[in-house]
Interface confidence: medium
């Protein structure tokens, strides 16, 4: 019979022959022959391969370097890499999470829309009309202006996105 030019899924062509790929978590030791199956071996303790493969070496698990503020979010297996995240108070600088930076603060006039996590920075939003923030914070939202009416007072100074309104007593009309 004619030697194959293409192989089925999870197979590879070598020496005019279709051999089985090694399953995830295993590496190739020797190709199949006319008489023997592909020989595979499990990856070592701190290694992995995440696809059907013909790799002769497994990949090393990622190291979450505590000196860069990293910690293990999910321990690697023979089939998956280790996932790193940042220590509390810090977040990843990239999707690969190779280092961490401190969460940023929202400036006055802006409030926190979403508190930062290990993988995302603080999300700030401008304080809309009726709200203000006079602080620099990674935690505080915009606060509503004080309602002078509910205190039986009147607005003496309008609020801004950075300042609260100033309330004062109502002018009494003399009889």
């Amino acid at each position: 019979p004619e030697p194959p030019t293409a192989c089925r899924e999870k197979q590879y062509l070598i020496n005019s022959q279709c051999c089985s790929l090694c399953q995830p978590g295993q590496k190739l030791v020797s190709d199949c022959t006319e008489f023997t199956e592909t020989e595979c071996l499990p990856c070592g303790e701190s290694e992995f391969l995440d696809t059907w493969n013909r790799e002769t070496h497994c990949h090393q698990h990622k190291y979450c370097d505590p000196n860069l503020g990293l910690r293990v979010q999910q321990k690697g297996t023979s089939e998956t890499d280790t996932i790193c995240t940042c220590e509390e108070g810090w977040h990843c600088t990239s999707e690969a999470c190779e280092s961490c930076v401190l969460h940023r603060s929202c400036s006055p006039g802006f409030g926190v829309k979403q508190i930062a996590t290990g993988v995302s920075d603080t999300i700030c939003e401008p304080c809309p009309v009726g709200f203000f923030s006079n602080v620099s914070s990674a935690f505080e939202k915009c606060h509503p202006w004080t309602s002078c009416e509910t205190k039986d007072l009147v607005v003496q100074q309008a609020g801004t996105n950075k300042t609260d309104v100033v309330c004062g007593p109502q002018d009494r009309l003399r009889a």
Partner: nanobody, 119 residues
Amino acid sequence: EVQLLESGGGLVQPGGSLRLSCAASGFTFSTYDMIWVRQAPGKGLEWVSAISPNGTGTYYADSVKGRFTISRDNSKNTLYLQMNSLRAEDTAVYYCAKPPQVNTEFDYRGQGTLVTVSS
């Protein structure tokens, strides 16, 4: 000029307590979050705790939760860290810091105060 000056460090036995202080000047202290970070010998910086400008929001790393308490006195421009049930692994230089507006490491941090937990 922004200045942060830590004090209160020292040698303490495991299980003991210390209270760190940080005197701030050169900026409007009451309008900023403040944080404590620490650096153990040969290690990187570790975030310890944070407090919101008015002191109502406090946040802690898992490693110190339930043992450390952060507080502030805006009338005195001072930040505090009460450390109880101290462990050997708490040994480090402790810094108070003003967090960044952008993604730099810190806007400012102090010179630090050394806490040594040993019997």
